[in-house]
């Protein structure tokens, strides 16, 4: 499945509404890092069948989706940027989707790969949990929010690397 | 391959200004901070200040706050550390450093070559 | 601003040493702690982050601990080209500082 040119335009352009989300000074919020054991060994070059990355990929920016769609996240972020992050996000999902259909069916994809999709959930989880522990201060969401850039830019090396095996 | 390449030694006078460079290749620039750090000859490391390159944020050590200029250029990957006005007391090794952010990884995991200053009359 | 102090600050050692260097911070930083080692003339090196983690490439003989105000950077058998000076410096918060070095020597 070749996924459309718009695709990697999106991603930047998600990258760049993140880096426009930002409230306060990170330099302040330091003292505030924290180890969310980002899932690395499922975004590397191990042998990854294609309709597997893109299941994860979904499953990334489907969490990435959410957690930015919470009531907590509207209260703590730009309104504005957040509606453009949505819009983005929607479409990678869309073209993702499409490419999980063609790559392996419907009916298999979802429990395929559940080991994959579980380990990008539970990292998620780990991140929510970091948000609520912290009362979704101004610092934990700037810790959130340079967490996510890193996946996110995780996310878009291995799509490049799908692309370069096609 | 990470890279951050300083520029060259600089013989200077008192009074005189300088701007020296670390230019960062292997990596994408913007994701990272950097930091400057000094060494004075026989003595131990002083940070100096840090600069996101993203947006040109800035923070310096309070003995380094006004001292000194940090900024960037992101569209060349160079990170610049500034004086206006010299003193013999610069006389140093100047090292570049990367930084992660508030990301959790290495801290000053690659550095420049340094930068030797040596001001003089 | 968060005080560094290392201990000792040289000390002499022969191969094969098992080599500890102390670092206390003047409040508590977690864990947040790296060590460096610099040889005359060179970048310093990071060898230790996050009190613990041993960077990429760092031989296993390098060992961090500690957490809250009191650290340890142990080698655990010395190597000739261990000899060096060894820096640690907190990541807590800015300022960040350094400690003022503990320079290893051969006996």
């Known amino acids: 499945c070749d996924l459309p040119q718009t695709h990697s335009l999106g991603n930047r352009r998600a990258l760049i509404l993140l880096a426009q989300m930002r409230r306060i000074s990170p330099f302040s919020c330091l003292k505030d890092r924290h180890d969310f054991e980002f899932p690395q060994e499922e975004f590397d070059d191990k042998q990854f069948q294609k309709a597997q990355a893109i299941s994860v990929l979904h499953e990334m920016i489907q969490q990435t989706f959410n957690l930015f769609s919470t009531k907590d996240s509207s209260a703590a972020l730009d309104e504005t940027l957040l509606d453009e992050f949505y819009i983005e996000l929607d479409q990678q999902l869309n073209d993702l989707e499409s490419c999980v259909m063609q790559e392996v069916g419907v009916i298999e994809s979802p429990l395929m790969y559940e080991d994959s999709i579980l380990a990008v959930r539970k990292y998620f989880q780990r991140i929510t949990l970091y948000l609520t522990e912290k009362k979704y201060s101004s610092c934990a969401w700037e810790v959130v929010r340079a967490e996510i850039m890193r996946s996110f830019s995780l996310s878009i090396n291995l799509q490049k690397r799908l692309k370069s095996k096609e | 391959e990470v890279q951050l390449v300083q520029s060259g030694a600089e013989v200077k006078k008192p009074g005189e200004s300088l701007k020296i460079s670390c230019k960062g290749s292997?990596?994408?620039?913007?994701?990272?901070?950097i930091g400057w750090v000094r060494q004075m000859p026989g003595k131990g490391l002083e940070w100096m200040g840090i600069i996101d390159p993203s947006d040109s944020d800035t923070a310096y050590s309070p003995s380094f706050q006004g001292q000194v200029t940090i900024s960037a250029d992101k569209s060349i990957s160079t990170a610049y550390l500034q004086w206006s006005s010299l003193k013999a007391s610069d006389t140093a090794m100047y090292y570049c450093?990367?930084?992660?952010?508030?990301?959790?990884?290495?801290?000053?995991?690659?550095w420049g070559q340094g930068t030797l200053v040596t001001v003089s009359s | 601003d968060i005080q560094m102090t290392q201990s000792p600050s040289s000390l002499s050692a022969s191969v094969g040493d098992r080599v500890t260097i102390t670092c206390r911070a003047s409040q508590s930083i977690d864990g947040s702690l790296n060590w460096y080692q610099q040889k005359p003339g060179k970048a310093p090196k990071l060898l230790i982050y996050?009190?613990?983690s041993l960077q990429s490439g760092v031989p296993s003989r390098f060992s961090g601990s500690g957490s809250g105000t009191d650290f340890t950077l142990t080698i655990s058998s010395l190597q000739p080209e261990d000899f060096a000076t060894y820096y640690c410096q907190q990541s807590y918060d800015f300022p960040l500082t350094f400690g003022q070095g503990t320079k290893v020597e051969i006996k």
């Open positions: 292997g990596y994408s620039f913007t994701s990272y901070w």
């Open positions: 996050f009190a613990s």
């Open positions: 450093a990367r930084h992660p952010g508030l990301n959790w990884a290495p801290d000053f995991d690659y």
